[in-house]
């Protein structure tokens, strides 16, 4: 719950909140979980810490880890963890998705895309931005404070934008990239990462012995049909063809359906004449695009047939 | 500089097996989804298969399903295409591909290896 | 599956010309639809990805257009590099399917 997920690439500075919050008069003590070990406030250090926030200036792949902030007040003590993951620069121009932050809509009317925690920096104008790695020109495009501006929206407006503005602390320089996808509203079709309806993470299905269940893993990918969407089931991390047991059968082919506009998928996984050794199993929900990979896990529980007396 | 280099490619009788290999440099393989594409002798290009960054799906063209395996190994950067019950209207160049993502959900095919040449023939 | 219908199958043009290129998915693809290039004996190039949008180190006088069915690829000023087949290609549904391919050949 008190922990954030925060990335960067290596020779860029890289700044982070904690995720507990507190009065400005509070200290904030910084450590490296793996350690325990102290993180300094003195600035001359590459990495250290300024009140709430974790300061990597430049970061370097081996600053990756868990941060744990304490929050300190007079009457009571927060903790929270800051998962730090920095990455290699890419050779090629392709942004990965483990470096995007959350996708914005825009429409004709509202195209606004605000650059991704730029709040967090000390940063001037201008601020510059890349579409699929292209510096964008024209009119159309306005540089804003820290958004962009598109005017008549297209759906070819549509991919990846990349701010990129320069970090200043005590008359250092530092340079901070971030991309984010962008997509049209009233376009025929978009797409998202995958979000599973059913079933919920963690959740445990009661099932009888001796009985058939059936478990229905669905998702649902973005507009319109999906390029290589797909659900499927895996158990204890394995494809159902290959975990070799005949009772587990998963439903040929995907049912295609529609959710408030949104293309969805369904696959049944059918369990015949359930054993207790099913109940030991692992069962993963898994739907995929060219996003990437969501996953819920479901476990079987006995459910205790009522006793009918006579 | 970002490159796939397929091998493997021979002459086959029918009936016969063949695997095929690709071999990516220059970029994170294992965060890509990727595909394998053919195009027969003066012919156009037919997708054959295509397998997900995390190999955990794959997909296949109706004339190589069943005949056909797409796999990958993470931990070697490569790509392979498993061939068996080759038939003589499988004669192609066979590309491997990397399948870019664009925002509205649809992808290309931004890298392509040089090709090798499978021939199906008795 | 969808069908990707080119046009012309094949053309002649003088370097300096403009080329228009034609390519009817048989079903409203949204915008999903690249464009690729190839010259004999080599593997394909990606020059148009997202109907519109340019690749990374292809040159602007190439150019995409087109949303739903009818899509174009435009060669604004043809070099004698530019001479080779073009294909067009949706990436809307699985399978993705190629069109047939379209020869632009020395006048």
């Known amino acids: 719950k008190f922990s954030k997920q925060s990335w960067g690439l290596e020779n860029e500075a890289l700044i982070v909140r904690c995720p507990r919050q507190g009065k400005p008069s509070y200290t904030v003590d910084w450590y490296y979980s793996q350690t325990n070990k102290s993180i300094p406030t003195q600035e001359r250090n590459r990495v250290f810490a300024s009140g709430q926030l974790l300061k990597f200036l430049p970061a370097a792949v081996a600053d990756s880890g868990i941060y744990t902030c304490i929050v300190r007040s007079p009457t009571f003590n927060r903790t929270g963890y800051a998962n730090v993951t920095i990455y290699k620069k890419q050779s090629d121009c392709n942004v990965p998705d483990y470096l995007m932050y959350s996708t914005v809509s825009g429409s004709e009317k509202n195209s606004k895309i605000y650059c991704p925690t730029i709040d967090l920096y000390n940063w001037t104008a201008p601020l510059e931005w890349f579409k699929n790695c292209q510096a964008l020109q024209g009119s159309r495009y306005r540089a804003h404070k820290s958004f962009l501006v598109i005017d008549n929206v297209m759906t070819e407006d549509a991919g990846d934008y990349t701010c990129k503005f320069i970090h200043n602390e005590n008359g250092a320089n530092y340079s901070v990239t971030a991309t984010r996808s962008f997509t049209v509203k009233d376009e025929q079709g978009f797409s998202l990462f995958p979000v599973i309806g059913a079933p919920a993470q963690n959740e445990i299905k009661e099932v009888e012995i001796g009985k058939n269940a059936n478990l229905t893993c669905s998702a649902c990918f973005g507009k319109g049909t999906q390029f290589l969407a797909a659900v499927l089931w895996q158990l204890n991390g394995t494809k159902i063809t290959d975990f070799g047991e005949p009772r587990i059968q998963q439903e040929e082919g995907q049912n295609q359906s529609f959710s408030n506009g949104l293309a969805c998928l369904d696959m049944v996984l059918r369990i015949a004449d359930v054993k207790e050794e099913d109940l030991l199993l692992q069962y993963d929900c898994l739907a995929l695009n060219l996003h990437g990979l969501r996953r819920h896990t479901v476990r079987l529980s006995r459910k205790n047939p009522i006793d009918h007396h006579s | 500089e970002v490159q796939l280099l397929e091998s493997g490619g021979g002459l086959v009788k029918p009936g016969g097996s063949l695997r095929l290999s690709c071999a990516a440099s220059g970029f994170t393989f294992s965060s890509y989804w990727m595909s394998w594409v053919r195009q027969a002798p003066g012919k156009g290009l037919e997708w054959v298969s295509a397998i997900s960054g995390t190999a955990i799906n794959t997909y296949y063209a109706d004339s190589v399903k069943g005949r056909f395996t797409i796999s990958r190994d993470d931990s070697k950067n490569t790509l392979y295409l498993q061939m068996n019950s080759l038939k003589t209207e499988d004669t192609a160049v066979y590309y491997c591909?990397?399948?870019?993502?664009?925002?509205?959900?649809?992808?290309?095919?931004?890298?392509w290896g040089q090709g090798t040449m499978v021939t199906v023939s008795s | 599956d969808i069908q990707m219908t080119q046009s012309p199958s094949s053309l002649s043009a003088s370097v300096g010309d403009r080329v228009t290129i034609t390519c009817r998915a048989s079903?409203?693809?949204?915008?999903?639809l690249n464009w690729y290039q190839q010259k004999p004996g080599k593997a394909p190039k990606l020059l148009i990805y997202?109907?519109?949008s340019l690749q990374t180190g292809v040159p602007s006088r190439f150019s995409g257009s087109g949303s739903g069915t009818d899509f174009t690829l435009t060669i604004s000023s043809l070099q004698p590099e530019d001479f080779a087949t073009y294909y067009c290609?949706?990436?809307?549904?699985?399978?993705?399917?190629f069109g047939q391919g379209t020869k632009v050949e020395i006048k």
């Open positions: 290609q949706q990436s809307y549904s699985t399978p993705p399917t």
């Open positions: 591909a990397r399948v870019r993502r664009d925002s509205s959900g649809g992808g290309a095919f931004d890298i």
């Open positions: 997202a109907a519109s």
């Open positions: 079903q409203g693809i949204s915008n999903n």
